[in-house]
């Protein structure tokens, strides 16, 4: 059974992945120039159900593309050096969803936009930390 | 819990830069993300942007874009905040807060010719 | 962005009195809804969070509840040191918003 100093530290973990993934999509809604447009032509697997923190494996399998449409984004406007961003975000969902059971992600029919991803992360992450506290 | 101690007032002119800190001090730096929030005399409060002080990657208000610069140095547990191309209305008080729930004293700067 | 509105701007009340601040934000916020008191001068001291949650060392006269779009804060008791400025801040997505602020002052 979870402890509370583990509950703890997986509540610190999740509220991090939720503020690295919520900097994003303020980086991007900021932006007002063709790279949004062209960043919106990528396509992201959405998972078909995200529950539990094991479908974080999901999100795992989809860093690199995000890493890669990011990078499309630097500029001087642009601050959150994906590099250093994602590798903060991988290290935590590493963690959050554990090295012992190996789960293979089931994706959805329908591809989505980087902002529509980024909300369902978002909104997956809240929702496990309200079950938290 | 962590403490954020901020550097002192400063008076400005027009055009100029101001760099503000928020020293943190009583736990691990890097557990907080440090959220900049303004102030303005008489007004209410404005989010300015967010830094993750372990990887020193920010984001900021839409407002700010281009004008504001959060930094870090994990040495010292700092975190910067620096503010361009200044104008009267950026007189404000400035606060630093970590996690939203943990906030520095404020620093007041003024902007006049 | 989502935009924070607050009911009443001001009001006046009495030690003692029953108070009751409304939030409303402009699209669904969930419960990641905060509330600040401050004081003159002072930063602002969080007393609720995730809309109902008493933040560690605030008197338990004062509790928050709602969510999704509207919430409020209510102090059932009102104490001389509460006599201040209350704010409302979403933080379910950036940028960080917050109400303009409600003034409760003495009548």
């Known amino acids: 059974a979870p402890t509370s100093s583990s509950t703890k530290k997986t509540q610190l973990q999740l509220e991090h992945l939720l503020l690295d993934l919520q900097m994003i999509l303020n980086g991007i809604n900021n932006y007002k120039n063709p790279k949004l447009t062209r960043m919106l032509t990528f396509k992201f697997y959405m998972p078909k159900k995200a529950t539990e923190l094991k479908h974080l494996q999901c999100l795992e399998e989809e860093l690199k593309p995000l890493e890669e449409v990011l990078n499309l984004a630097q500029s001087k406007n642009f601050h959150l050096r994906p590099r250093d961003l994602i590798s903060n975000i991988n290290v935590i969902v590493l963690e959050l969803k554990g090295s012992e059971t190996t789960f293979m992600c089931e994706y959805a029919d329908e591809t989505a936009t980087i902002v529509e991803f980024l909300n369902r992360w978002i909104t997956f992450c809240q929702s496990i930390i309200s079950t938290l506290t | 819990q962590v403490q954020l101690v901020q550097s002192g007032a400063e008076v400005k002119k027009p055009g100029a830069s101001v760099k503000v800190s928020c020293k943190a001090s009583g736990d691990e730096f890097t557990r907080y993300y440090v959220h900049w929030v303004r102030q303005a005399p008489g007004q209410g409060l404005e989010w300015m942007g967010i830094?993750?002080?372990?990887?020193?990657?920010?984001s900021y208000a839409q407002k700010f874009q281009g004008r504001v610069t959060m930094t870090r140095d994990t040495s010292t547990s700092t975190v910067y905040m620096e503010l361009s191309s200044l104008r009267s209305e950026d007189t404000a008080v400035y606060y630093c807060a970590a996690g939203l729930f943990i906030w520095g004293q404020g620093t007041l700067v003024t902007v006049s010719s | 962005d989502i935009q924070m509105t607050q009911s009443p701007s001001s009001l006046s009340a009495s030690v003692g009195d029953r108070v009751t601040i409304t939030c409303r934000a402009s699209?669904?916020?969930?419960?990641?809804l905060a509330w600040y008191q401050q004081k003159p001068g002072k930063a602002p001291k969080l007393l609720i969070y995730?809309?109902?949650n008493l933040e560690t060392g605030v008197p338990s006269r004062f509790s928050g509840s709602g969510s999704g779009t509207d919430f409020t804060l209510t102090i059932s008791s009102l104490q001389p040191e509460d006599f201040a400025t209350y704010y409302c801040q979403q933080y379910n997505r950036f940028p960080v918003t917050f109400g303009p602020g409600t003034k409760v002052d003495i009548k």
């Open positions: 699209q669904s916020i969930g419960r990641w």
């Open positions: 830094i993750n002080p372990s990887g020193g990657y920010a």
């Open positions: 995730s809309a109902s």
